[in-house]
Interface confidence: low
Amino acid sequence: TRDIREPPALKYGIVLDAGSSHTSMFIYKWPADKENDTGIVGQHSSCDVPGGGISSYADNPSGAGQSLVGCLEQALRDVPKERHAGTPLYLGATAGMRLLNLTNPEASTSVLTAVTHTLTQYPFDFRGARILSGQEEGVFGWVTANYLLENFIKYGWVGRWFRPRKGTLGAMDLGGASTQITFETTSPAEDRASEVQLRLYGQHYRVYTHSFLCYGRDQVLQRLLASALQTHSFHPCWPRGFSTHVLLGDVYQSPCTVAQRPQTFNSSARVSLSGSSDPHLCRDLVSGLFSFSSCPFSRCSFNGVFQPPVAGNFIAFSAFFYTVNFLRTSMGLPVATLQQLEAAAVNVCNQTWAQLQARVPGQQAHLADYCAGAMFVQQLLSRGYGFDERAFGGVIFQKKAADTAVGWALGYMLNLTNLIPADPPGLRKGTDFS
């Protein structure tokens, strides 16, 4: 007889996803003896940092570090004490900090210095706080999705690795300040900045990726608000009966609204703006976000950015999921085709404030913005990225896979901790038939 072995020891890793609107902490775990297996790393727990994203602390950098303390204290409880010292801890900041770094590099540096100071106070193996490039954000999101769905390699029942026949899944991420599209392509990249070559488990992947700064949901809403102030005395995407006071300083402080910014304005002035429930004018307003007039390549998505034709199936996560899920569940509208998605957007944009509140009891936050959000998602996918009905049929809207949030964080950690080998593991792996 053999001794019954104890369950293998677990390893842990922590990633702080410092997004534009908020920061999330993800704790991952995996069996120590199966580090090179695909789909082995999973989410252990998570924590949402209260308040805004770290970029909102530009005027109070130390507050950015302080804001993380609650989640870090949770990490001390969630990761076994004997594993603290060996647990890598990373902070990656995305488009909110990219924007801050463009407009105020000194503030950006101060914020990163402050969070670094806080993170080094904890007993984890802190490995740095940095701003991810848009390309990294896109590619690591793609790696996360395909790793979790086991699209890279699979472990056969006879203990042999094989490459599954299914291809990889494209990834679309809609954050607060930027949006990313990433997919495997056979088309040559005409723009060197959009191609990434990856070698994972001995397989070669040529991936197209692009990140559109200022095309995240929150910044799009700000830009539409700025456009509405510029061209209308009302907001066509807001529901009729909804009215609010808009602080001009808030609207125009973002670098994303620079094109609509008046030469002179009183930043402390408040302007009253009402909704008009006008789907057609709202569509026109959203259309203004995309430029198709210039393409220096054989083909483009929008704004003169090279993009090969979308190919294969896609997973659309983060705000793509939240927007479509709202249409599907809260509004009870079908969104299986592009035509249905457009009809659903029009439907939401036709609702008055009273009708919307009746349809969605509990006064959901950002309820007035779902019309603009739905119009944007529909136009981004169809006109922007060029999905036709057939291609759209291959898009799934999902925020989790294998009980783990889909986003760049897991892919980032897998990369930095070398949990995805470049070369294939040995033919036999772990299965003892003796």
């Epitope: 900045a193 220096p296 950015v305």
Partner: antibody, heavy 125, light 106 residues
């Protein structure tokens, strides 16, 4: 430093062809598109076309389709432009120019950041 | 194609003078670039994307404008600024250049 060095002046007869070269140095040749621009005496600059050296993909101004053929030799970091069926109106200085770009709030902006010294092509019988 | 019209065709200025060159587009463009060409030389990038100064270009050069009307300003002309200045649009295919403004120094 980044440099584009073009071949010397050419005098050619009407109906003939000419192939001019542009050798790049000081940067990774395949990282940037190479464009060609025409400057006829007393005329404005005219964009002829470009090539992506990494994938040999070329694009032409409609006005120069059939007139110009742009190619590259990656191993020599050199771009070429062949002009065919030459006529007197093809007499001009031809420039190669590297296409630079920068990304600004999600939009790619393009411009010619480095130019060759120019090659004078004279079409004369 | 978009036609860019530059004015004046020729401009004569004294050292230290402030001058403005204009570039008018036949239809709206997102941005333009300015190039400087001295006799017997290739054009050189001066200003990209309407108002950004290219590397090594002195701060006396500045650009502005939007839509169909753009300007290049030299705040204090120097003798070495004698050249032909071209505007160039990359908003609409095919990419086109203006006819140029020749700046002469008195």
């Amino acid at each position: 430093q980044v440099q584009l060095v073009q071949s010397g002046a050419e005098v050619v007869k009407p109906g003939a062809s000419v192939k001019i070269s542009c050798k790049a140095s000081g940067y990774t040749f395949t990282d940037y598109n190479m464009d060609w621009v025409k400057q006829a005496p007393g005329q404005r600059l005219e964009w002829i076309g470009d090539i992506n050296p990494k994938y040999d993909i070329s694009t032409y101004n409609q006005q120069f389709k059939g007139k110009a053929t742009i190619t590259v030799d990656k191993s020599a970091s050199t771009a070429y432009m062949e002009l065919s069926s030459l006529r007197s109106e093809d007499t001009a200085v031809y420039y190669c120019a590297r296409r630079g770009f920068f990304l600004y709030y999600g939009i790619n902006y393009y411009y010619f950041d480095v130019w060759g010294q120019g090659t004078l092509v004279t079409v004369s019988s | 194609e978009i036609v860019l019209t530059q004015s004046p065709a020729t401009l004569s200025a004294s050292p230290g003078e402030r001058i403005t060159l204009s570039c008018s587009a036949s239809s709206s463009v997102s941005y333009i670039h300015w190039y400087q060409q001295k006799p017997g030389q290739a054009p050189r990038l001066l200003i990209y994307s309407t108002s950004n100064l290219a590397s090594g270009i002195p701060a006396r050069f500045s650009g502005s404008g939007s839509g169909t009307f753009y300007t290049l300003t030299i705040s204090s002309v120097e003798p070495e600024d004698a050249a032909v200045y071209y505007c160039h649009q990359w908003s609409s295919y095919p990419w086109t250049f203006g006819g140029g403004t020749k700046l002469e120094i008195k």
